[in-house]
């Protein structure tokens, strides 16, 4: 997200359209308390950050309350009165959605429907990844709403699932972040398990009738 302007690298994350986090990495100013000044309107005076992030005792970022804002953040990172990085960015294009909540699994024979609470804003993809100990890598399926049906599962296998939310790139552009993954949940024969065995268990012999 940031090359260097006077040796400063920045990262912007807009958490769930609620909080903007701007962090900086300034090797030239590694032992300096840089200050963060911002405004949401190009004609206003700058405000100074009131919620700094610290790293090794020095300022390294700022958290801003920015509930459902879709405007431009004007900001200036300063060493005293000297600006070392000044920019203006549309915040919404650095969206990181929140992790899926209330994830539920509904099993029907060889298929499972994964649901969760849809976020309050749109243009998102809800991605479910799953694998069994027999799989070398995660399989993935995604939908526009948090209602994802995965078919063709083997009822005898144990599957691990997790879910995340991604902003659609053709809407929000290339600078967004996927949400954190939900907790891994393990299922076998429609029942929740503590874990799936790392090594595949041999199939149980079929009982003759």
């Amino acid at each position: 997200q940031g090359g260097a302007a006077e040796g400063v690298q920045i990262q912007i994350i807009y958490f769930n359209l609620e909080t903007v986090q701007v962090t900086w990495n300034a090797s030239k100013y590694s032992r300096t308390n840089l200050t963060f000044h911002y405004r949401f309107n190009g004609d206003e005076a700058y405000d100074q950050c009131t919620n700094y992030l610290l790293q090794e005792g020095h300022t390294s970022g700022c958290l801003l309350d920015a509930e459902q804002r879709d405007d431009i953040l004007y900001f200036s990172i300063r060493n005293g009165t000297h600006p070392v990085f000044t920019a203006s960015r549309w915040m919404v294009y650095y969206l990181k959605p929140s992790s899926p909540k209330h994830v539920r699994f509904s099993w029907h024979q060889d298929a499972v429907t994964v649901t969760c609470s849809d976020l309050s804003y749109g243009d998102l993809l809800y991605e479910v990844q799953y694998r069994s100990p027999f799989d070398t890598e995660w399989q993935s399926k995604q939908e526009n709403t948090c209602n994802v049906t995965i078919e063709g599962l083997d009822a005898e296998k144990c599957y691990s699932f997790w879910v995340r939310v991604k902003a659609m790139e053709d809407v929000y552009g290339p600078d967004t972040y996927p949400s954190d993954w939900s907790e891994v949940t393990c299922w076998q024969r429609g029942e929740i398990r503590d874990a799936c065995a790392e090594t595949p268990t041999p199939p149980k012999p079929k009982l003759s009738k």
């Epitope: 302007a5 431009i72 809407v171």
Partner: antibody
Framework: EVQLLESGGGLEQPGGSLRLSCAAS????????MNWVRQAPGKGLEWVSA????????YYADSVKGRFTISRDNSKNTLCLQMNSLRAEDTAVYYC??????????WGQGTLVTVSS | DIQMTQSPSSLSASVGDRVTITCRAS??????LNWYQQKPGKAPKLLIY???SLQSGVPSRCSGSGSGTDFTLTISSLQPEDFATYYC?????????FGGGTKVDIK
């Protein structure tokens, strides 16, 4: 498919007014910041104005501030530029463009505004 | 406002040539630099964003580099469809500003 279609250009006298429109389709219009960019005949590109997805925040180049007003109707997927107190130097092709911090991948075909007496 | 200076303003080249266009910002703009191609009577087309990222659908013979104040657009082997005018644009801070353009025509 994303489509942007400008209209409303034409010949206007200095001091007059024009209203440009940009009809958007193929995407969730209200999710996007939108821009107006202009290009005088034989010249380069000049950013004119921008508006946030909700329409709550607007931004202008100094050259048009106080004369032009950008607006949007998200229920009709329409972006507008009201141009008042027109000057000869406002003569240009006006483009609407959809984009983000990393460039503008979608542009309309442009509409020509000529300001002349 | 940040001024963007492009050079050269025009150049003549042949099909197969390697073409380099430079853009200089009046102050450091990190990597917030985009390149557009424009053909007569048409809207600009985004080629490169964030200094070096290739826009989807753009041929790989186009590449961008640079950070801070100096940036370069390179077309490794010019094709007939590449004869056009190229613009750089900074998206570091508003007002967003463009370079004056570089017209690439046939030698």
């Amino acid at each position: 498919e994303v489509q942007l279609l400008e209209s409303g250009g034409g010949l206007e006298q200095p001091g007059g007014s024009l209203r440009l429109s940009c009809a958007a389709s193929g995407f969730t219009f209200s999710s996007h910041a939108m821009n107006w960019v202009r290009q005088a005949p034989g010249k380069g590109l000049e950013w004119v104005s921008a508006i946030s997805g909700s329409g709550g925040s607007t931004y202008y180049a100094d050259s048009v501030k106080g004369r032009f007003t950008i607006s949007r109707d998200n229920s009709k997927n329409t972006l507008c530029l009201q141009m008042n107190s027109l000057r000869a130097e406002d003569t240009a092709v006006y483009y609407c463009a959809r984009g983000h911090n990393s460039g503008w991948p979608y542009w309309g075909q442009g509409t020509l505004v000529t300001v002349s007496s | 406002d940040i001024q963007m200076t492009q050079s050269p303003s025009s150049l003549s080249a042949s099909v197969g040539d390697r073409v380099t266009i430079t853009c200089r910002a009046s102050q450091s703009i990190s990597i917030y630099l985009n390149w557009y191609q424009q053909k007569p009577g048409k809207a600009p087309k985004l080629l490169i964003y964030a200094a070096s990222s290739l826009q989807s659908g753009v041929p790989s013979r186009c590449s961008g580099s640079g950070s801070g104040t100096d940036f370069t657009l390179t077309i490794s082997s010019l094709q007939p469809e590449d004869f056009a005018t190229y613009y750089c644009q900074q998206s570091y801070s508003t007002p967003l500003t463009f370079g004056g353009g570089t017209k690439v025509d046939i030698k």
